[in-house]
C-alpha cells in the first residue's frame, strides 16, 4: 500500500532574473527513495540518485543548481520558465510518487517570494 504523501511548495512566483527553490518532501512512509527526477512538462531537468548523487541535464547546467536537499534551485529566471514542475520520487516498495509545483515568473517586483501552500 502506498501510504506516503508528497508535500510541495505549491504555487510560487518569482521575479525575472531572480532565483527560486523548488522543494518537495516525501513523508508518512519508510519506503527507500532510489531516485528523484525533476521535470518541467516533458523535459528532464535533473536527477538525484541515492547512490550516484546529482546529474543536471546538459541544457540546464548553467541555470539549475542541485539542492538544498532533494530540492532544485532555478537561477536567472525568464518568463519562459513559467509553468508546471514535477518532482518524481522513485521508491521501493511503494513505487512512484509525484509532486506538482506551479511557478509563475513575473516581470515586476510584485512577485511573492516563498508563497507556500499545498495543492491537493
Amino acid at each position: 500500500m502506498m501510504t506516503g504523501t508528497i508535500e510541495t511548495t505549491g504555487n510560487i512566483s518569482a521575479e525575472k532574473g531572480g532565483s527560486i527553490i523548488l522543494q518537495c518532501h516525501l513523508s508518512s512512509t519508510t519506503a527507500q527513495v532510489t531516485q528523484v527526477n525533476w521535470e518541467q512538462q516533458d523535459q528532464l531537468l535533473a536527477i538525484c540518485n541515492a547512490d550516484l548523487g546529482w546529474h543536471i541535464s546538459p541544457s540546464f547546467k548553467d541555470r539549475v543548481a542541485p539542492g538544498p536537499g532533494l530540492g532544485l534551485t532555478l537561477q536567472s529566471l525568464t518568463v519562459n520558465d513559467t509553468g508546471e514542475y514535477f518532482c518524481i520520487y522513485h521508491t521501493y516498495p511503494d513505487g512512484t510518487y509525484t509532486g506538482r509545483i506551479f511557478l509563475e515568473v513575473l516581470e515586476s517586483s510584485v512577485a511573492e517570494h516563498g508563497a507556500r501552500f499545498q495543492i491537493p
Epitope: H25, A31, D51, G53, Y92, P93
Partner: antibody
Framework: EVQLVESGGGLVQPGGSLRLSCAAS????????MSWVRQAPGKGLEWVSE????????YYPDTVKGRFTISRDNSKNTLYLQMNSLRAEDTAVYYC???????????WGQGTLVTVSS | DVVMTQSPLSLPVTPGEPASISCRSS???????????LEWYLQKPGQSPKLLIY???NRFSGVPDRFSGSGSGTDFTLKISRVEAEDVGVYYC?????????FGGGTKVEIK
C-alpha cells in the same frame, strides 16, 4: 565499502532500558531507510523496526511498539534503538541493516547481544 | 500479518546434488506497485545473515549462479543446483510487501 557496526548491547534487568547504536560508513547514510532485525538465541530472524532516510517516518511490529524507539542522527551517520521496559523475550542479537538494489536488507552489521535477565 | 511458512524445517543434502526450499505466504505478497518483494537470506553458523535473492528471482551481487529463486503470488522456491559444503546454514525467506515485514521460520541445510 558499506560498513555497519552495532554497539551498546549488554546485560540488563527486566523492566530496564538500553540504547543500541549502529555506526554507518562507506555510503551516504542520509539517503537510506534503515532497519533493526533481531535473533533470539537458537531462533529465527525477526524484524524490529525501520526508519525513513529523513527520520520522519517509523514502523514497528506489535511485539515492540510503545517500548522501542528507532531514531537516527544523519550528521553522525548513526542509527539508534532505544529499548525500554525490556522483557526476557527481548534477549537477542540485534542487527542493523540497510537496503540496496531493490532489496530490504542488502547489508548487515555484525550484531550486538542484548541479554535481559535478573 | 503475513505469515511466511518454510519447508522443510531441516534439509540433509549431499554435495553435488540439488536442493530445494519452499516458502508460502498466508496471503499474496504482490505489492500495489506490481512488484513482489520476496527475498532469501542465508545465515552461516556464527555469522550475520547474507542476502542471496531479491524480488523473487534476482541474485544479489557475488551470489553464485547455482542459487536461483522462483515463484509468484503466495508460493516461492529457492533452488541450489549443486550443493557445496559452504552452503550449509539456515535459509530464511522474507517479505516486505506488507507491514509488518515478516520472515519465514528458517530451513537448516546440513551435509549428510
Amino acid at each position: 565499502e558499506v560498513q555497519l557496526v552495532e554497539s551498546g548491547g549488554g546485560l540488563v534487568q527486566p523492566g530496564g532500558s538500553l540504547r543500541l547504536s549502529c555506526a554507518a560508513s562507506g555510503f551516504t547514510f542520509s539517503s537510506y531507510t534503515m532497519s533493526w532485525v533481531r535473533q533470539a538465541p537458537g531462533k529465527g530472524l525477526e524484524w524490529v523496526s525501520e526508519i525513513s532516510s529523513s527520520g520522519g517516518s517509523t514502523y514497528y511490529p506489535d511485539t515492540v511498539k510503545g517500548r522501542f524507539t528507532i531514531s537516527r542522527d544523519n550528521s553522525k551517520n548513526t542509527l539508534y534503538l532505544q529499548m525500554n521496559s525490556l522483557r526476557a523475550e527481548d534477549t537477542a542479537v540485534y542487527y542493523c541493516a540497510r537496503p540496496g538494489l531493490g532489496a530490504w536488507f542488502a547489508y548487515w552489521g555484525q550484531g550486538t547481544l542484548v541479554t535481559v535477565s535478573s | 500479518d503475513v505469515v511466511m511458512t518454510q519447508s522443510p524445517l531441516s534439509l540433509p543434502v549431499t554435495p553435488g546434488e540439488p536442493a530445494s526450499i519452499s516458502c508460502r505466504s498466508s496471503q499474496s505478497i504482490v505489492h500495489n506497485s506490481g512488484n513482489t518483494y520476496l527475498e532469501w537470506y542465508l545465515q552461516k553458523p556464527g555469522q550475520s545473515p547474507k542476502l542471496l535473492i531479491y524480488k523473487v528471482s534476482n541474485r544479489f551481487s557475488g551470489v553464485p549462479d547455482r542459487f536461483s529463486g522462483s515463484g509468484s503470488g503466495t508460493d516461492f522456491t529457492l533452488k541450489i543446483s549443486r550443493v557445496e559444503a559452504e552452503d550449509v546454514g539456515v535459509y530464511y525467506c522474507f517479505q516486505f510487501s506488507h507491514v509488518p515485514r515478516t520472515f519465514g521460520g528458517g530451513t537448516k541445510v546440513e551435509i549428510k
